[in-house]
Every structure is written in C-alpha cells, then in structure tokens.
Amino acid sequence: YNNFRKSMDSIGKKQYQVQHGSCSYTFLLPEMDNCRSSSSPYVSNAVQRDAPLEYDDSVQRLQVLENIMENNTQWLMKLENYIQDNMKKEMVEIQQNAVQNQTAVMIEIGTNLLNQTAEQTRKLTDVEAQVLNQTTRLELQLLEHSLSTNKLEKQILDQTSEINKLQDKNSFLEKKVLAMEDKHIIQLQSIKEEKDQLQVLVSKQNSIIEELEKKIVTATVNNSVLQKQQHDLMETVNNLLTMMSTSNSAKDPTVAKEEQISFRDCAEVFKSGHTTNGIYTLTFPNSTEEIKAYCDMEAGGGGWTIIQRREDGSVDFQRTWKEYKVGFGNPSGEYWLGNEFVSQLTNQQRYVLKIHLKDWEGNEAYSLYEHFYLSSEELNYRIHLKGLTGTAGKISSISQPGNDFSTKDGDNDKCICKCSQMLTGGWWFDACGPSNLNGMYYPQRQNTNKFNGIKWYYWKGSGYSLKATTMMIRPADF
C-alpha cells in the first residue's frame, strides 16, 4: 500500500482509502457497539500504575481485557472477511473495469486502426491513381516516341533516298564535268591551233605592213620629189611672169605679186585656188612650224579648217594634255588638230565655229557660233563662244560662259569629280556639262543611256552617243 487514509463519514462508519498506483480503493467499516471508543474515559496507561491493585479487581480487569481482546480478534476477523469480500468485489469490479477499459482501448485502437486503414487505403488509392496517371503518361510518351521513331525512320529513309538521288546526280554531274573537261581540252587545243595560225597570219601581216611602209616611204619620197618639181615649176612660172612683166613694163606698170606658198588656214588654201577636199599643210601664225589639217572645200561655201572629227571609233580620244595640245589621229579620218594651233589661229582674227552632227537614225544637225576663240595654254585653252544659230539646239551645248579645257591628266573643270576621267576624252567640261564630242565611241543599238558617250544634249538629249561629229572653223569675213 502506498497510501492509507482513515476518516469518518457522516453516519459514523469508518472509511479506509487505499491508493495503489493509479487505483484508489475505499472501504466502509461498521462501528462496533461493545467496543469502547477512543474517547472513553479509560486510560490505557492505568496498567502501569505503581500502586498495587486488589486481585479481584485485577481478575475482573483481566477478563475485561480478554473480552476486549476477543472482541478485537473477532473484529479483526470480521474486518479481514469484510476486506476479503470487498476485495473480491473490487477485484471483480477492477476486472470488469479493466475489461471495459481494454474494450474501450481496443475499440479506440480498432477505430484508430480503421482510420489508419482508411487513410492508408486513401493514400494507396492516390498512389494507385498516380501510378495509373504515370503509366498512362508513359504509355503516351512511349506512343509518341514510337511515332517520332517511325517519323525519324521515314525521314532517314527519305534522306537515304535523297542521298542516293544526290549521289546519282553527283555521279552524273561528275561524268558531265569529265566530258566538259575533255571538251575543254579539245577546245584549248583548237584555240592553241587557231592562236598558232593567227600568229602566222600576224607575222604575214607584219611583213605586208613592212612592205606597205616601205612603199609609203617610197611614195612620200616620190611625193616630195613631185612637190619639189611643183615648187620648181611654180618658181619657173614666177620667173617667166617676172620676165614677161619686165618685158612689158613700158606697157603695164603693174607688177605681179609673188605666189603665196604657206597657208595659215583652209580659207587661204581655198582662196589660193585649191577647191578640193583634202589634207593640206598649214603654217602656225608668225612661225615656220607646220601642221597637217583636213580642209572641207565644199560644205557651206568651203574654206573650212577641220579641227575635230569622229566617225567610226578608230582613234582613242582619252589622251593627255600634251597630245590634245599638239594634236593626234589621222586628218583623213578621226583626229584632233591641236589646241595650240587653234588658239594661235583664232587669236589672229575673228573666226566662226561650225559643229556638224549625225545621229544613228540618219538625221543631221549643226550649231554655228559667229565668234569663236581659244585662250592661250596659260589660261587652259578656255573656249569663248558668241552668237549661236543652227538646228542642233537653241541653247548652247557647250556651257556658257566658256570653260577651261580638261584632260585625264589636266583637271580644270568645275566638278568635285574629274570629268575627263569620268566621261573620257579632253573637253571644255563644266560639271560636267551638256556636251562632250570627245567621249567614248559607241556603235549603233549600244548608244543610249551612256554616261560617257559622244554627247550634244540640246540636240539628242542625255545619254545619247552620236554617230559622227565634225568641228570646223573659218574666218568670219570669208
């Protein structure tokens, strides 16, 4: 017993409470009538008195004590029985309680187990659903993979067939290339043969040219001889005339003028009686320096000195400053007479300039300037023009006022560019201006939309390259 308590209840019964662990037991005991209560006047220590008592009194007391002892024993036995009875009852109660408690616990555990089982079942269901979902997803993925695999297989097959096709094509092309190579080799051989033949031809032509040159030299010599003979004849004629005038001096006092042999321009040649078109030797003013020029003795009354001609593209007009200064080309064909001679000539007296033009459609036109001259080289042979008439445009295609002359190596134009290089040829470029009769020569059907052709804007417009041009001068008083 851990704890033992004793108390009195309200009806006088004694209570005994026993605490054992978590269990508490209460015993109700009946109070004995023949037993003296603890509050009786009997004093327990009377036995211990020193004064001797009388015998009867002692026997009586002993009997009382015996009775008390017997009562106590009976009481204890009763108590024991009572306790045993109560204990049995309690034990039965305890057992019943225990069974009830265990049942409750069992029920609780069962309930818990059921709850847990339900929970587990739910979880299992969830897991099962998840597994199903996962399985479905995997099945779908598997299906997709199989589909993509099929697709890839198909693509691979397609690509394989494509590769086979390409290989076939490649082999075909290789064959073609080889065939072309063979053809190329054959062509090269034939070209080589042609080249050899051409070389032979060229060497033949060279020998012919040499012969011709020799003939030309001979002809020139003959020409010189003829000219000398002509000169001698003229001198003889002059002498004869002098003699005649001397013999007739009494009758006719007029003395014949000496025949003029050197000519400044074609007008002088014409006036001297030479009225046939051709090349004539002209002399620089105030100089013995000579220059060959073509004289037009038929057009517009004749006496025209040709200073420029374009007709077939046989001469390159993209020349240097010096070449334009002294002249180049062939007077019977395409040529430039020379800026220095023209400058000197036109500063001696007043000259007119006529520009004659031909297009590719068979049309002809001209521009006539009633006053023309070129400044000196120091002033870059600047052109001066006045009084335009003619059929090649009412506005001058040579920019007014006149510009300096420019060549590929002498840029004197008013452009941020170099007109002579851009448009080709030497000309009185502005920036770059409405004309350039020394541009590139373009053949028919290739002569439009040209940036560097033979241009005379106010007759044929922009980009039109002309077929033929002639620039000619003549004294204004001719």
Epitope: C415, I416, M422, A431, P434, K450, G453, S462, G463
Partner: nanobody
C-alpha cells in the same frame, strides 16, 4: 547595259496615293544619284525629287514637299517615290533617271537635267475624279 524601268503608275482620285518604283540594272545605286522627273502634256520636263545614296541626301521640288517621299532599297537596286495627297496638277508621265553621284558642281547639292544620262521609259500617273 544600263537600264531603268519605272512602274506603279495609274489612275487615282484626288487625295489618293501611289507608289512608283524605279528598278535599276547595269550599275549599283551606291555610286549614282537617282532623280524622279515628270512631263505633263505640252509642258517641259521638270525635276520632282532626287536621292543620292552615298550620303543619303534627298531633294524635293517645292510643289511636292510634304506630299512625296523618295527612298531606296540597295538590296533590290530600286528607288521608290511615295506620292500622297495627289492633285490633278500632278498628272504627268513620271520618269526616273541616273547620274554619277560625283558629277556635282563645286558648292552645289544637285544636278542639272542634262547631267542625268540614263533614263527610263516613263510611267503615266493620272489624277482625276
């Protein structure tokens, strides 16, 4: 061979819009200036707008300023003329023409008509209700 081909012309009502194209071949726009010109019946050819690709400069005649826009696409070698708020007086044959970009007089920005050496055949624009 240098060639310019115009397209995009047609009949349009006053206030309407048209976009003309000028396709160039035989040269690249980088080194050239392209101009749009127009010629009305019985009138002289006049400059409308020009573009120079090497410096991105553009020019507009006073009569078209604020209404017309010139642009170029070098990848297509083509120049465009966007014409908005069209008027009856804009009726004409429209030509595009090319000039080497460097062919400029000192101190000047644009080119006289005679410097444009390559021309297209033209496209007719009619503004009428």
């Amino acid at each position: 061979d240098v060639q310019l081909v115009e397209s995009g012309g047609g009949l349009v009502q006053p206030g309407g819009s048209l976009r003309l194209s000028c396709a160039a071949s035989g040269f690249t726009l980088d080194d050239y200036a392209i101009g749009w010109f127009r010629q009305a019946p019985g009138k002289e050819r006049e400059g409308v707008s020009s573009i120079r690709d090497n410096d991105g400069s553009t020019y507009y005649a006073d009569s078209v300023k604020g209404r017309f826009t010139i642009s170029s696409d070098n990848s297509k070698n083509t120049v465009y003329l966007q014409m908005n708020s069209l008027r009856p007086e804009d009726t004409a044959v429209y030509y595009c023409a090319a000039v080497p970009a460097g062919r400029l007089r000192f101190g000047e920005q644009w080119y006289p008509l005679y410097e444009y050496d390559a021309w297209g055949q033209g496209t007719l624009v009619t503004v009428s209700s």
